[in-house]
Interface confidence: low
């Protein structure tokens, strides 16, 4: 009967997704998939002693064991507000509602006599209302609320007398409600009833420490279920034609070492000791798992052969619960030293392998939020998205027969040992209110959408387009700071003397007096690492190369008193040698990469960008670079990502905004200097590059998140773009937001006030828009106190684990770049835009498929922006040429200069100018586009040193 679930952990342990479809499936669920929502009677009904209801073991437990909780009475009051529950179900559009019957509400002392009329009326009304709405009821007979009288009289589930009493109760329910109920659950999560009720004492009746009692209770629960199944099968199924099962709950677990047989064995033991304890007898061979029998010996009761036959096969489908109750508290779990995991897909695979591919109803799934979270339960959306995506993959990719899904729970309510400290509802209920209104949370809206679409539709993207970028498009690659070689590596032609060797037989060199030869002038190829750069660039087939100068190397003292001519010569060589290969340079003057900011030491010690003298020093440095390199360089970036640099000055918001102000002025002065002194002769263009990730609301159902997404863009991009591209001043939205927080005493930050002269200085000091775009961030509003830039924005980020992302958690969201480009054009007008850095880190050292996927998808979106949105996109610079050791692997080349396969991919993209249709020929002449010539590459590699 039983299979072996161990194979689940032997699947590719090192699998890393490299495209979206491997991680997240945009697809629909099967046609008649059963969508539902669930509640437990004790959790939501309230009215614990109203209208003749008897007390349950949980009512007693709450009074005796739970601190600060007087009763379950507050709850959501479903017993009183049935109509409100029905409206909530209507809102979501479910196909079924899973609820439990409160045994003591029907039979106050547990024994089946005449049913309590008011209780009976409640359940009849509920069932009739569901049938009227075409909502299928799934009814649980026992969700932990045993009549207290049975506990006190018999010792509860420890006593096998309860088996027959439970069967009587079930018989009554089948007789009374069976005409309207086609799906029955006998017991909800018997593992927790036994383990926490009698082992840890965390659940009612709160007994603990007696392991024999735990397994006796488990034994009686199995026998009770089995008896009820046979009862239904014999007496009710023939005319009611329903199905009956038991809901079994479990965690999931992953081995510490995926290749380690012992760790996998421990994972198997962990699953068997929880899920297998009940599933093996019921869904397997009728007996407990061998491992449990060996380990527990006399503690575990025995099934006789007759009982095994009786128990085996007593479930018409596999009802599976996967939620927080099986994951807490961690210290009571059967982890066996391995790692608990929320991978529902793997758990379903284990059930498929272990129990012969049964039909599965997910009878409980969901997570929880803190009690203070009201309707904006953003994390709940992502948990649901993740779980549902795993279920969909299990169905579509693993061929697991899941036929229904129960989101848990319909309402906030009483959460067992956590009482009212957590919430699990799709609907928010204020427990202190009289009317107990059910307010849909974001997760309710999300689930409603899932049900309406029967899954996940891909509505984020416009279909791919075929087309090409313009012929003068800059196909570039970006490198960070190039450290100049301080000494040319090959000075062999700088000695003017002639030598004779071994003239006297002493094997020495003798200088010939009176003879002086012409020395070879210094050559660019004297620098070894320029040769390396050129080799890599030639293989990239790019038209443009963006790199940064090292300010501290060019001007070690920070001023023009000590110019490092060798460094300037090195940089001139990089540019001129590149030009020989048809590769133009985009040169960045200042590219801070480290906490030391890349400033000359004296400037750093004087306060760095908090000191206005750094501004003057930068202008002088820029002038020097324009003068020395400007005849060869036509594209300049003054400062790379000043909007990121400023967060180093994060002692206070005022430091941040002060540093940013000085960076803006430094850029503007450099631009004005170029405009005035160098543009007439050099005819170049100057800008600064901004870090420009796109932002989306983490919760699309929350207005505050939409506002937070726009605010992120204002604080991140507009902060620098507005003064330079548009008004000469900081964005009004940013200024107002900070001022408002200041007024409310939440922050002492203030944006600097700009004089008219400063506004005139800043405004219009860009010749093009340069954006560094890597990813899209999911942002949410969270009011943060404090006077730092980070807290001034009131923004937190959310990582969507269902999204494809890189090792450093950069999400691959191609459509974000198109949205960004459209936003920039809408806000700052029709201007030339260069994407000056864009890329992803990819662990692969050779076949970097994630990078290829990223390039293809992001460039496709840039092309849409160009062709459909008419954005004047002038160039795309992939980041970056070579990776640095011990850093995330963003490079096309490894740190020891080995080429990765994405290079060929980028080559192809460049040679075809984008995504041409099958029959279109290249529109661009070879003179307009750089092509790699084999001889050139050979010469570059073989140039003498």
């Amino acid at each position: 009967f039983s299979g072996d679930g161990r194979a689940v952990w032997s699947k590719n342990p090192n699998f890393t997704p490299v495209n979206e479809s491997q991680l997240f499936l945009y697809d629909t669920f099967p046609k008649n998939f059963f969508w539902g929502v669930g509640t437990g009677a004790l959790q939501v009904e309230g009215s614990w002693k109203k209208d003749g209801k008897g007390p349950s073991i949980w009512d007693h437990f709450v009074h005796t064991h739970l601190k600060n909780v007087s009763s379950t009475n507050g709850s959501s009051d479903s017993y009183i507000f049935l109509e409100k529950d029905l409206s909530a179900l209507d809102f979501i559009g479910v196909s079924f509602y899973q609820f439990s019957i409160s045994w003591p509400r029907l039979f106050p002392d547990g024994i089946v006599t005449v049913a309590n009329a008011k209780g009976l009326q409640y359940y009849n009304t509920l069932l009739d209302s569901l049938v009227l709405r075409n909502i299928e009821p799934i009814v649980t007979l026992y969700h932990w609320d045993l009549p207290l009288a049975l506990q006190e009289k018999y010792g509860g589930w420890k006593n096998d007398t309860i088996i027959d009493i439970f069967n009587d109760y079930a018989t009554y329910c089948f007789q009374t409600f069976g005409d309207r109920v086609k799906y029955w659950i006998t017991i909800h999560n018997p593992y927790l009833v036994a383990w926490h009720g009698y082992g840890t004492g965390m659940h009612a009746p709160g007994e603990k420490g007696n392991l024999a009692a735990v397994y006796t209770v488990g034994h009686n629960l199995i026998k009770a279920h089995s008896k009820v199944w046979h009862n239904y099968n014999t007496h009710f199924r023939p005319h009611q034609k329903g199905w009956l099962s038991i809901t079994l709950g479990s965690h999931w677990i992953e081995p510490n070492r995926s290749e380690n047989t012992m760790d996998i064995l421990k994972c198997q033991q962990s699953m068997v000791s929880v899920l297998g304890w009940f599933a093996s007898p019921i869904h397997g061979d009728g007996d407990y798992p061998e491992g449990m029998k060996k380990k527990l010996l006399s503690i575990l009761p025995l099934f006789s052969e007759a009982e095994k036959n009786e128990v085996r096969g007593t479930a018409d489908f596999f009802a599976f619960s996967f939620g927080p109750n099986n994951f807490k508290p961690l210290n009571t779990m059967a982890k066996m030293g391995q790692n608990v995991s929320l991978n529902l897909r793997e758990a379903l695979n284990w059930i498929k392998l272990e129990y012969n591919n049964p039909q599965i109803l997910i009878a409980e799934n969901g997570w929880f939020t803190d009690s203070h979270v009201k309707t904006e339960d953003t994390t709940a959306i992502y948990m649901m998205k993740n779980f549902l995506s795993q279920v969909l993959q299990a169905i579509r990719l693993d061929e697991i027969r899941v036929f229904g899904y129960t989101a848990w729970s319909l309402l906030d309510g009483f959460e067992w040992q956590d009482a009212y400290t957590i919430r699990r509802g799709l609907f928010y209920v204020d427990f202190n209110s009289k009317q107990k209104e059910r307010k849909p949370k974001s997760s309710a809206h999300y689930y409603k959408q899932i049900i309406r679409e029967n899954g996940f539709s891909l509505k984020e993207a416009t279909p791919d387009v075929q087309g090409q970028f313009p012929c003068d498009f800059s196909w570039g690659v970006t490198e960070s700071v190039l450290k100049p070689e301080s000494v040319a590596s090959s000075p062999q032609f700088s000695d003017p003397y002639l030598y004779v060797w071994n003239a006297t037989g002493n094997r020495l060199l003798h200088r010939v007096e009176g003879v002086r030869l012409k020395t070879r002038p210094a050559q660019c190829t004297d620098f070894v690492n320029i040769k390396k750069q050129l080799e890599m660039l030639a293989r990239m087939k790019v038209t443009h190369y963006r790199f940064a100068l090292d300010w501290a190397s060019v001007l070690p003292t920070g001023n023009l008193s000590a110019v490092n001519r060798q460094a300037l010569r090195y940089y001139r060589c990089v540019v001129s040698e590149g030009l020989k290969l048809g590769i133009s340079a985009m040169v960045t003057l200042y590219y801070p990469t480290h906490a030391h900011l890349g400033l000359p030491e004296p400037l750093l010690h004087a306060g760095g960008w908090l000191n206005p003298s750094t501004v003057e020093a930068f202008q002088a440095y820029a002038g020097l670079c324009f003068q020395e390199l400007g005849d060869l360089v036509k594209l300049w970036i003054t400062i790379n990502e000043p909007n990121r640099l400023s967060d180093i000055y994060n002692r206070s918001g005022n430091d941040t905004y002060g540093a940013a102000h000085n960076l803006l002025v430094a850029h503007a002065l450099a631009w004005r200097l170029y405009d005035r002194q160098f543009r007439p002769s050099q005819r170049g263009a100057v800008s600064l590059s901004l870090h420009a990730d796109w932002a989306e609301p983490a919760n699309p159902y929350a207005d505050s998140h939409w506002r937070a997404a726009e605010r992120f863009l204002q604080f991140e991009i507009a902060w620098f773009a507005e003064p330079l591209f548009k008004t000469g001043d900081y964005p009004a939205a940013m200024r107002e937001y900070i001022a408002s927080k200041h007024r409310r005493g939440l922050s002492s930050s203030a944006l600097p006030r700009l004089t008219e002269a400063e506004r005139r200085l800043l405004k219009g000091t860009v010749d093009f828009c340069a954006l560094n775009h890597f990813t899209t961030r999911f942002v949410m509003h969270e009011q943060l106190a404090g006077s730092r830039y980070d807290s001034d924005r009131d923004i937190q980020f959310l990582q969507d684990i269902t999204r494809l992302s890189s090792p450093t958690r950069l999400a691959v969201i191609p459509w974000g770049v198109r949205k960004l480009l459209r936003w920039v054009r809408r806000n700052y007008g029709d201007m030339d835009i260069y994407i000056t850095a864009s890329g992803i880190d990819d662990q692969a050292l050779e076949d970097d498929r994630l990078r290829k996927y990223y390039l293809e998808k992001y460039l496709q979106e840039v092309l849409k922006a160009y062709l459909i949105d008419k954005v004047r996109i002038k160039g795309y610079y992939a980041f970056k040429l070579a990776e640095e050791k011990s850093k995330p692997r963003f490079g096309f080349f490894t740190s020891d200069f080995k080429a990765k396969s994405s290079i060929q991919f980028y080559n192809k993209m460049i040679s075809s100018s984008g995504f041409p249709s099958e029959n279109s020929s290249s529109r661009c002449s070879q003179t307009q586009k750089n092509t790699e010539c084999t001889v050139c590459l050979f010469l570059v590699q073989k140039k003498p040193l």
Epitope: A595, R788, T808, K885, P888
Partner: antibody
């Protein structure tokens, strides 16, 4: 300027749980470039890394002590807390917290500022 | 997990150059950071990313890293340089910080 200050009990009994707090100032625990590590040093012995918490709340623990450690942060209080269960006399040491700088939001650049350390003795 | 090996002690006369090594499998492909710790004090970062110096650290401190050995070099050693020195890397495979066992630098005389 940037400072970190450790606080916690001086004396702990065997089997008890140690809770240490690192209060930071001069930088934000939200800042994408900042992370905080806990390191300890038994008397006369080498530094031993215990745990690290990144700005995005990701956590990393020393393999040998993983089952006993929990690191967390409270950004609003500018505090990082380390909890170490089941203390033993061999855990007697000076416990340091240190800021680690990452650049570009992702790269690890060493621990540039350390607290002065708090000495914890485990004895019955 | 990744292991870093340092010599327990290094002695050097004032004014001379001290070299402290840190061995590790292919350590050249890792970024190495060096800390100085004087008795009774907390460690101080003296070199990061193989060879970069934080501001305030004298130019006498330099670092290099290739192959299986990283080296901290202290030129023109002074009595005040006497301390324990630790190398450290971030092991990206396990997301763990790894310290070397430390080297005691003694300044003779």
């Amino acid at each position: 300027q940037v400072t970190l200050k450790e606080s916690g009990p001086v004396l702990v009994k065997p089997t008890e749980t140690l809770t240490l707090t690192c209060t930071v100032s001069g930088f934000s625990l939200n800042n994408a470039r900042m992370g905080v590590s806990w390191i300890r040093q038994p008397p006369g012995k080498a530094l031993e890394w215990l745990a690290h918490i990144f700005s995005n709340d990701e956590k990393s623990y020393s393999t040998s002590l993983k089952s006993r450690l929990t690191i967390s942060k409270d950004t609003s209080k500018s505090q990082v807390v380390l909890i170490m269960t089941n203390m033993d006399p061999v855990d007697t040491a000076t416990y340091y917290c240190a800021r680690s700088v990452v650049t570009g939001g992702y790269y690890y650049d060493g621990m540039d500022v350390w607290g002065q350390g708090t000495t914890v003795t485990v004895s019955s | 997990s990744y292991v870093l090996t340092q010599p327990p002690s290094v002695s050097v006369a004032p004014g001379q150059t001290a070299r402290i090594t840190c061995g590790g499998n292919n350590i050249g492909s890792e970024s190495v950071h060096w800390y100085q710790q004087k008795p009774g004090q907390a460690p101080v970062l003296v070199v990061y990313d193989d060879s970069d110096r934080p501001s305030g650290i004298p130019e006498r401190f330099s670092g290099s890293n290739s192959g299986n050995t990283a080296t901290l070099t202290i030129s023109r050693v002074e009595a005040g340089d006497e301390a324990d020195y630790y190398c450290q890397v971030w092991d990206g495979n396990s997301d763990h910080v790894v310290f070397g066992g430390g080297t005691k630098l003694t300044v003779l005389g």
